[in-house]
């Protein structure tokens, strides 16, 4: 997310087209309260951050309200009046959608439909990952809305599920972040379970003829 200037590394996350978080890691200034100055228009004067993030008592980031924006964040991180890092970035390319809410499961024999509340903007992928203790890795299925049907499940097996949202790379580019995963939920025979046994009962050995 942009090279370091004077040893400053930055990270930008645009949470759900609502809030922009810019954090910095500046080893040279680790005991300094750097200030963050920003503007959304290249012609305006800089405003100073009013909502700092602190780490070990010193500023380490800024949170900005930025509801549904598709423009450039111009910013400057300063030590007093001295700029130590100045840059501009298209915020939307650092989108992190919010985690799926109101996740529901609807079972029909060997299939389950996973639904959740759709987010209020488009070009997203809703990904469901699932596995049973017999699976060595997670299986995955994704759709453009939060309505994902997974077929061919074994009704006798216990399955763990979780859901996340991703921004489509074709639209938002390669630097976005997937949402946090929803909580894992476990299901067997169409009923919710506290957990799936970590180690499945080993299959009975075949008797050699």
């Amino acid at each position: 997310q942009g090279g370091a200037a004077e040893g400053v590394q930055i990270q930008i996350i645009y949470f759900n087209l609502e809030t922009v978080q810019v954090t910095w890691n500046a080893s040279k200034y680790s005991r300094t309260n750097l200030t963050f100055h920003y503007r959304f228009n290249g012609d305006e004067a800089y405003d100073q951050c009013t909502n700092y993030l602190l780490q070990e008592g010193h500023t380490s980031g800024c949170l900005l309200d930025a509801e549904q924006r598709d423009d450039i964040l111009y910013f400057s991180i300063r030590n007093g009046t001295h700029p130590v890092f100045t840059a501009s970035r298209w915020m939307v390319y650092y989108l992190k959608p919010s985690s799926p809410k109101h996740v529901r499961f609807s079972w029909h024999q060997d299939a389950v439909t996973v639904t959740c509340s759709d987010l209020s903007y488009g070009d997203l992928l809703y990904e469901v990952q699932y596995r049973s203790p017999f699976d060595t890795e997670w299986q995955s299925k994704q759709e453009n809305t939060c309505n994902v049907t997974i077929e061919g499940l074994d009704a006798e097996k216990c399955y763990s599920f979780w859901v996340r949202v991703k921004a489509m790379e074709d639209v938002y580019g390669p630097d976005t972040y997937p949402s946090d995963w929803s909580e894992v939920t476990c299901w067997q025979r169409g009923e919710i379970r506290d957990a799936c046994a970590e180690t499945p009962t080993p299959p009975k050995p075949k008797l050699s003829k």
Epitope: L17, N41, G42, Q68, R69, D70, D71, I72, W90, V92, Y93, L95, D118, L119, S120, Y121, G122, D123, N144, T145, C146, N147, M168, D170, V171, Y172, G173
Partner: antibody, heavy 119, light 107 residues
Framework: DVQLQESGPDLVKPSQSLSLTCTVT?????????WPWIRQFPGNKLEWLGY???????NYNPSLKSRISITRDTSKNQFFLQLNSVTPEDTATYYC????????????WGQGTLVTVSA | DIVMTQSQKFMSTSVGDRVSVTCKAS??????VAWYQQIPGHSPKVLIY???YRFSGVPDRFTGSGSGTDFTLTISNVQSEDLAEYFC?????????FGGGTKLEIR
């Protein structure tokens, strides 16, 4: 408010390229938003063709991907549509507009320019 | 591609009436739908976005509703200047697609 104005030839021969310009006033096309082209066929059916984002990235309708190019001249605050190998089926009113990523509705439109493809 | 279907090509109404224009998506598009008004000889103008949010400057007699696959634009207290064609559009996933339009005729 942002204003958009399309310009270009109103008649193009089949197999040639259609080239249109959109001139934007009251907003810099490098400051933000996406800058799409949309066309409206006789009979009023609308089709999104593609856009160029303020960052310079483009996205096109897959049905036209092999024939379309959207570029810009930031010094003139203009963006352009080029559609190659046109046929009479490309006859339409062509609009430029402004939208934004994630919420790709078209908040501002030009007045449109009718392009006829005919020998 | 997602197909947006406006099954009524024409609707007839009178000044002061209430009319509802419908739009159906071929698959769920969440709430990522906009509505446009196109007065004859003019460019389309956005009325509603995100299914139910009025764009700035749009009179409050225009309301949008729906989610998933079924969407409605309602015009209450129809005025003579509402004589126009109305289009829905989905932006849930590209390529972004429009409905075929519904022409509102004032009796």
């Amino acid at each position: 408010d942002v204003q958009l104005q399309e310009s270009g030839p109103d008649l193009v021969k089949p197999s040639q390229s259609l080239s249109l310009t959109c001139t934007v006033t009251n907003y810099s096309i490098t400051s933000g938003y996406s800058w799409p082209w949309i066309r409206q066929f006789p009979g009023n059916k609308l089709e999104w063709l593609g856009y160029i984002h303020s960052s310079g990235r483009t996205n096109y309708n897959p049905s036209l991907k092999s024939r379309i190019s959207i570029t810009r001249d930031t010094s003139k605050n203009q963006f352009f549509l080029q559609l190659n190998s046109v046929t009479p089926e490309d006859t339409a009113t062509y609009y430029c507009a402004r939208s934004q990523l994630g919420l790709v509705f078209f908040a501002y439109w030009g007045q449109g320019t009718l392009v006829t493809v005919s020998a | 591609d997602i197909v947006m279907t406006q099954s009524q090509k024409f609707m007839s109404t009178s000044v002061g009436d209430r009319v509802s224009v419908t739009c159906k998506a071929s698959q769920s598009v969440g709430a990522n739908v906009a509505w446009y008004q196109q007065i004859p000889g003019h460019s389309p103008k956005v009325l509603i976005y995100s299914a139910s949010y009025r764009f700035s400057g749009v009179p409050d007699r225009f309301t949008g509703s729906g989610s998933g696959t079924d969407f409605t634009l309602t015009i209450s207290n129809v005025q003579s200047e509402d004589l126009a064609e109305y289009f829905c559009q989905q932006y849930n996933s590209y390529p972004y697609t429009f409905g075929g339009g519904t022409k509102l005729e004032i009796r």
